[in-house]
């Protein structure tokens, strides 16, 4: 951080770290969540053979996980900062119900699952501060989310394991795309 005017620099530890910019803070937060996802994926892959499964399509039909598309303006071709930022925030808000689902899915990584969920809420806050066009951001309907959660929790064990794997994989891909896009902003 900078040395306050009027103060002798010897009073302040050197070298001085500037406070994080909003972009740096967002970048660090996404990486923090990605590290958490890595830990959760390790447990999922150790516990079942879902990570090598070719039957993903069966479970994927039940899920409507957020994905980046050309029209979202987050890819290098056709990049649009405002559209993309809205997509990232909307996507993260849509992922929240799936992160809630993950909360009871881990034995040894219970804390990490909670951390990923909480850190995502913080990330949304950071991004909302950055976004000017907040009107364009639609918040998922709580009733719809509640019934989706009930439906996911009622699946058989195999489908629940597959759902967990797919959520983690999709969330990782979404965050990686977001990270790339945000670095262009």
């Amino acid at each position: 951080a900078p040395v306050p005017p009027g103060e002798d620099s010897k009073d302040v530890a050197a070298p001085h770290r500037q406070p994080l910019t909003s972009s740096e803070r967002i970048d660090k937060q996404i990486r923090y969540i990605l590290d958490g996802i890595s830990a959760l994926r390790k447990e999922t892959c150790n516990k079942s053979n879902m990570c090598e499964s070719s039957k993903e399509a069966l479970a994927e039909n039940n899920l409507n996980l957020p994905k980046m598309a050309e029209k979202d303006g987050c890819f290098q071709s056709g990049f649009n900062e405002e559209t993309c930022l809205v997509k990232i925030i909307t996507g993260l808000l849509e992922f929240e119900v799936y992160l809630e689902y993950l909360q009871n899915r881990f034995e040894s990584s219970e804390e990490q699952a909670r951390a990923v969920q909480m850190s995502t809420k913080v990330l949304i806050q950071f991004l909302q501060k950055k976004a000017k066009n907040l009107d364009a951001i639609t918040t998922p309907d709580p009733t719809t989310n509640a019934s989706l959660l009930t439906k996911l929790q009622a699946q058989n064990q195999w489908l629940q394991d597959m759902t967990t794997h797919l959520i983690l994989r999709s969330f990782k891909e979404f965050l990686q795309s977001s990270l790339r896009a945000l670095r262009q902003m």
């Epitope: 900078p2 923090y32 590290d35 501060k129």
Partner: antibody, heavy 115, light 107 residues
Framework: YIQLVESGGGLVKPGGSLRLSCAAG???????MSWVRQAPGKGLEWVGS????????YLNTKFIGRFTISRDNSKNTLYLQMNSLRAEDTAVYYC?????????WGQGTLVTVSS | AIQMTQSPSSLSASVGDRVTITCHGS??????VAWYQQKPGKAPKLLIY???SNYPSVPSRFSGSGSHEDYTLTISSLQPEDFATYYC?????????FGQGTKVEIK
């Protein structure tokens, strides 16, 4: 939340040394980390912080020359090496994730400097 | 180093009371101020960052405000679990500095 577990505290004589460790619950390669201390019945005092790769270290000037911060990302562990300890260094030492403010803290480890 | 002067150092209040704690920085802080709650024998918990943003899962009865050098933490309706010590922290300048704390006790 992400577990940060400090260890290495204990009783040490004035002039002695101690190395505190802070183990993270999972990979913390991309995180700035800090040490914050609290003397018994007193307020919080920032000791210093370290960048993700360990290439930038920021120490509160009052500890320069006596305390050193380091990290081993392969072990997901943060360290605080304290030399020439004084009675006034008696405190609970916390490690915390640093994004300018501290959103995740360890439970703390007590360091007592006494003869 | 930047001084963070917190007041009062302690206060007695009843459940349901509105409580206000202030923090004055010795220089302009650009809203780069956080507030923490600490209970005996526990690590501090982040409540507010950037002067007025509630950390997720922090109850809405906690709010932060302020600008320039002066910042405030308000608890709109004190609950039994809110009896604790509260600290402000500035992160505009190194070294990061904390206020000396405000102990909120039961009247």
């Amino acid at each position: 939340y992400i577990q940060l577990v400090e260890s290495g505290g204990g009783l040490v004589k004035p002039g002695g040394s101690l190395r505190l460790s802070c183990a993270a619950g999972y990979e913390f390669t991309h995180q700035d980390m800090s040490w914050v201390r609290q003397a018994p019945g007193k307020g919080l005092e920032w000791v210093g912080s370290i960048s993700p790769k360990g290439d930038h270290k920021y120490l509160n000037t009052k500890f320069i020359g006596r305390f050193t911060i380091s990290r081993d990302n392969s072990k997901n562990t943060l360290y605080l090496q304290m030399n020439s300890l004084r009675a006034e260094d008696t405190a609970v030492y916390y490690c915390a994730r640093d994004i300018d403010f501290f959103d995740t803290w360890g439970q703390g480890t007590l360091v007592t400097v006494s003869s | 180093a930047i001084q963070m002067t917190q007041s009062p150092s302690s206060l007695s209040a009843s459940v349901g009371d509105r409580v206000t704690i202030t923090c004055h920085g010795s220089y302009w802080l650009n809203s780069e101020v956080a507030w923490y709650q600490q209970k005996p024998g526990k690590a501090p918990k982040l409540l507010i960052y950037d002067a007025s943003s509630n950390y997720p899962s922090v109850p809405s009865r906690f709010s932060g405000s302020g600008s320039h050098e002066d910042y405030t933490l308000t608890i709109s309706s004190l609950q039994p679990e809110d009896f604790a010590t509260y600290y402000c922290q500035q992160y505009r300048y190194h070294p990061y500095t904390f206020g000396q704390g405000t102990k909120v006790e039961i009247k």
